[in-house]
Interface confidence: low
């Protein structure tokens, strides 16, 4: 790495995956192992986040970009960047401080992931119950009897399933 | 930079005893629960144990309550799980992690160490 030639600011040049280092005349040096400069003009580089325990690597630290954690199978990623881990439950079951716990009587989840909800309450809409809740899904409401006439048949289909990876907060 | 690191694993006979140190840097201790995880060959991560930020909280799985003790010394930024009356299903590599509780019910382990292995075998 030549001498930076910049009369305002040496440091300037110094391309990404280098750093100035004023230990050495303000020379471009390269980034130290384990550590990178995603920008230019970097006085210092910084350290690569490590994927260790419950993270997994999903893309290597390089001289120019951080590393990329995801989770380990049975876990999904939470926070911006992947910051957290979460274990997975199977549906029907939230998550509890002694790990997967079955859904309430009365509640339901349908994903791996989140929290247990209660079931719509059909008759709050003026409607009956036309398939009953379990553990991982809600129940189907429908027009009340009085509502059904011969030849009708207006059935409210359960919520479409939320994309994967989005869980209510 | 957080960091959490174990020791004092090895290899113990069935009914010895060990215990485990998890040294931590980078924020304060005091502010957070910890907790003990493991995962044995093959398997899953299973939570082991978890204590409050001042100690008076404490929890542990069905599969090692009363023989296993967590404790912590905030003064030296570390926590300790002293495993007594192993067995050979306690194989396995033992993590700690520190709690970020960020809504009720949910709890989040956002920093982990990597881990110590422990062998129970005769």
């Known amino acids: 790495f030549e001498r930076t030639r910049s009369l305002q600011d040496p440091c300037s040049n110094c391309p990404a995956g280098t750093f100035c280092d004023n230990n050495r005349n303000q020379i471009c040096s390269p980034c130290p192992p384990n550590s990178f400069s995603s920008a230019g003009g970097q006085r210092t580089c910084d350290i690569c986040r490590q994927c260790k325990g419950v993270f997994r690597t999903r893309k290597e630290c390089s001289s120019t970009s951080n590393a990329e954690c995801d989770c380990t199978p049975g876990f999904h990623c939470l926070g911006a960047g992947c910051s957290m881990c979460e274990q997975d439950c199977k549906q029907g079951q939230e998550l509890t401080k002694k790990g997967c716990k079955d859904c309430c009587f009365g509640t339901f989840n349908d994903q791996k992931r989140g929290i247990c909800r209660p079931w719509t309450n059909c008759s709050l809409d003026g409607k009956s119950v036309l398939v009953n809740g379990t553990k991982e899904r809600d129940v189907v409401c429908g027009p009340s009897p009085a509502d059904l006439s011969p030849g009708a048949s207006s059935v409210t289909p359960p919520a479409p399933a939320r994309e994967p990876g989005h869980s209510p907060q | 930079e957080v960091q959490l690191v174990e020791s004092g694993g090895g290899l113990v006979k069935p009914g010895g005893s060990l215990r485990l140190s998890c040294a931590v840097s980078?924020?304060?201790?005091?502010?957070?629960?910890m907790s003990w995880f493991r995962q044995a060959p093959g398997k899953g991560l299973e939570w082991v144990s978890h204590?409050?930020?001042?100690?008076?909280?404490?929890d542990y799985a069905d599969s090692v309550k009363g023989r296993f003790t967590i404790s912590r010394d905030n003064a030296r930024d570390s926590l300790y799980l002293q495993m007594n009356s192993l067995r050979a299903e306690d194989t396995a590599v033992y993590y700690c992690?520190?709690?970020?509780?960020?809504?009720?019910?949910?709890?989040?382990?956002?920093?982990w160490g990597q881990g110590t292995l422990v062998t129970v075998s005769s």
């Open positions: 980078g924020f304060t201790f005091s502010d957070y629960y």
């Open positions: 992690a520190r709690e970020d509780i960020r809504m009720p019910g949910t709890t989040d382990f956002d920093h």
């Open positions: 204590i409050s930020g001042s100690g008076t909280t404490i």
